[in-house]
């Protein structure tokens, strides 16, 4: 669901975190359309997500404590 | 009709160790997070951790990361929270609260009727 | 020390508007939704008021919430003696040193 780097909706799939290995965050105000978190899988997928979802933002903060952790 | 329902009371010795078991009925264990939310007498609410079952990966308060551990069972969908190195100041009523992780809201729809741990010293 | 910030203690009489407030800052309400628990006396805390302003099945719509800023309020409308009970605002935090969930300390409603 993304265009230009852009994402322009959610999936509807919940990821596992054992998947992902790290994540951007698209802003609304920085020329995209919506807010997004663009997870980026083990298999060199981008995901995009809805960053107000509950387990996107668990697994946000769970690889930002692994990042500030190392 | 989803419930959460807990093990009883508990009176423990300080440095002791508690564990309280939080068991869901009538719904999937998939889509949720349980949380772990605690009141001392007379006091406020504060969340102590939470897991995502389906994850099978706990967080924790800053407070209580070297001395709690949530765990869970999908089997038997209960979710357990142990309680470590008990002091006085750790009695209090544990309740356990549920979120639909796939909603974009973040609130606890489904609380537990709560578990009273008392720590004498 | 709770991390939200409620007046501890709100009163009013059957019939009146009492509205409680809940102020907190950029990581938790300023950034995330908010709501908002009743809990009454010896029981669970029961959801009140998710997302700001809605309210789950059942909550009757005496009851609202609003938000602003990095501050929300709760108000109660036609009071009723069953109001009578504990009211927690609480919002996902995004600063990773603190919980996931933070709560405010609480506000005791007296139905005079």
């Known amino acids: 669901a993304s265009n230009f780097d852009c994402c322009l909706g959610y999936t509807d799939r919940i990821l596992h975190p054992k998947f992902i290995v790290g994540f951007t965050r698209q802003l609304a105000n920085e020329g995209c359309d919506i807010n997004a978190i663009i997870f980026h899988t083990k298999k060199k997928l981008s995901v995009c997500a809805n960053p107000k979802q509950t387990w996107v933002k668990y697994i946000v903060r769970l690889l930002s404590k692994k990042v500030k952790n190392m | 009709q989803v419930q959460l329902v807990q093990s009883g009371a508990e009176v423990k010795k300080a440095g002791s160790s508690v564990k309280v078991s939080c068991k869901a009925s009538?719904?999937?264990?998939?889509?949720?997070?349980i949380s772990w939310v605690r009141q001392a007498p007379g006091h406020g609410l504060e969340w102590v951790g939470g897991?995502?079952?389906?994850?099978?990966?706990?967080d924790y308060a800053q407070n209580f990361t070297d001395r709690v551990t949530i765990s869970a069972d999908k089997a038997t969908k209960t979710v357990y929270m142990e309680l470590r190195s008990l002091r006085s100041d750790d009695t209090a009523v544990y309740f356990c609260a549920r979120t639909k992780i796939e909603l974009d809201n973040d609130a606890f729809d489904i609380w537990g009727q709560g578990t009273l741990v008392t720590v004498s010293s | 020390q709770p991390v939200l910030t409620q007046p501890p203690s709100a009163s009013g009489t059957p019939g009146q508007r009492v509205t409680i407030s809940c102020s907190g800052s950029?990581?938790?309400?300023?950034?995330?939704?908010v709501n908002w628990y009743q809990q009454l006396p010896g029981t669970a805390p029961k959801l009140l008021i998710y997302s700001n302003n809605q309210r789950p099945s059942g909550v009757p719509d005496r009851f609202s919430g609003s938000k602003s800023g990095t501050s929300a309020s709760l108000a109660i409308s036609g009071l009723q003696s069953e109001d009578e009970a504990d009211y927690y605002c609480a919002a996902w935090d995004d600063s990773l040193n603190g919980p996931f969930w933070v709560f405010g300390g609480g506000t005791k409603l007296t139905v005079l």
């Open positions: 897991i995502i079952p389906v994850f099978n990966t706990a």
């Open positions: 009538g719904d999937t264990f998939s889509n949720f997070a």
């Open positions: 950029s990581s938790n309400i300023g950034s995330n939704t």
